[in-house]
């Protein structure tokens, strides 16, 4: 469900408040619905980025929990094969607050596709 | 700076179709943004009518989706309400506004426009 | 029935602080966002995301969030905030957008 990711969102923007990352993450803030399953899967690669610097085992346990929720909604879609989409590296690399609003919309696209 | 601007006819009459349309200047419609109408009846609350994408993906109020539709025309910048067999309930000021990016806003509006529904 | 609640109303006297409150259990998957309208006028966006300010809006309006409950805080209250606020949110299935019902804002 959609839903209990954007929640896990929520959850890890509430947590990350308090620390000093200053990491950039490979951000997609333009996505065209016909490549959405690509940007959403380097979306759960760099969030990743986030556990690791964090350092911090709340963060950690959400972000597993939240990649799991992801990965288990995409499924439910079934096998789609996206041609003509950006690699991750291509895309431009924001810090995690730019990361986590454009994550919040490309979740939203999910939903409002859906 | 993004402007939104509404335009239409103020009075519909009972059972007809009220239609209205959102021209956007200082921005493009085709952004990554979504676009929503939002409306106001006198003296009341806010009321969420429905949004779209200018891929053509739309949303709706459940309890206005029988009734609404909400179309974009990326050539000329804007996009436009239709909400047919209109009552008396229905008078409202109605406002177009782009949603922000991630969390759920608005963040611009248009000025709003009064639309009277009588005989 | 709206799914955000609001209290009708709310008073504050000049410089003092007030907390407008928005109640809904969807806002434990989703931020609130506050918007401040006056008489005539469109609502303008004062707080979005966890606590954002749109450029041009005083840094006397703050928001917070826990649980089921979103706030905007307005510290050291001006005339000119007396307005009406609403906040914002999405509903249980994420695709509908909803607001509360309003909050009258009396600065006294």
């Known amino acids: 469900n959609w839903v209990n990711v954007i929640s896990d969102l929520k959850k890890i923007e509430d947590l990350i408040q308090s620390m000093h990352i200053d990491a950039t993450l490979y951000t997609e803030s333009d996505v065209h619905p016909s490549c959405k399953v690509t940007a959403m899967k380097c979306f759960l690669l760099e969030l990743q980025v986030i556990s690791l610097e964090s350092g911090d085992a709340s963060i950690h346990d959400t972000v597993e929990n939240l990649i799991i929720l992801a990965n288990n909604s995409l499924s439910s879609n079934g096998n789609v094969t996206e041609s003509g989409c950006k690699e991750c590296e291509e895309l431009e690399e924001k810090n995690i607050k730019e990361f986590l609003q454009s994550f919040v919309h490309i979740v939203q696209m999910f939903i409002n596709t859906s | 700076q993004v402007q939104l601007q509404e335009s239409g006819p103020g009075l519909v009459k009972p059972s007809g179709t009220l239609s209205l349309t959102c021209a956007v200047s200082?921005?493009?419609?085709?952004?990554?943004?979504?676009w929503s109408w939002v409306r106001q009846p006198p003296g009341k609350g806010l009321e969420w009518i429905g949004e779209?994408?200018?891929?053509?993906?739309?949303n709706y109020n459940p309890s206005l989706k029988s009734r609404v539709t909400i179309s974009v025309d990326k050539s000329k910048n804007q996009f436009s309400l239709k909400l047919s067999s209109v009552t008396a309930a229905d008078t409202a000021v109605y406002y177009c506004?782009?949603?922000?990016?991630?969390?759920?806003?608005?963040?611009?509006w248009g000025q709003g426009t009064l639309v009277t529904v009588s005989s | 029935s709206s799914e955000l609640t609001q209290d009708p109303a709310a008073s504050v006297a000049l410089g003092q602080t007030v907390r407008i409150t928005c109640q809904g259990d969807t806002l434990r998957s989703y931020y609130a966002s506050w918007y401040q309208q006056k008489p005539g006028q469109a609502p303008i966006l004062v707080i979005y995301g966890k606590n954002n300010r749109p450029s041009g809006i005083p840094d006397r309006f703050s928001g917070s969030s826990s649980g089921n409950t979103a706030s905007l805080t307005i510290t050291g209250a001006q005339a000119e905030d007396e307005a009406d606020y609403y906040c914002?949110?999405?509903?249980?299935?994420?695709?509908?957008?909803?607001f509360g019902g309003g909050t009258k804002l009396t600065v006294l």
């Open positions: 506004a782009r949603e922000g990016i991630g969390w759920p806003s608005f963040d611009y």
């Open positions: 914002n949110s999405r509903d249980f299935s994420g695709k509908n957008l909803v």
């Open positions: 779209i994408y200018h891929y053509g993906y739309t």
């Open positions: 200082g921005g493009s419609i085709s952004s990554s943004n979504w």
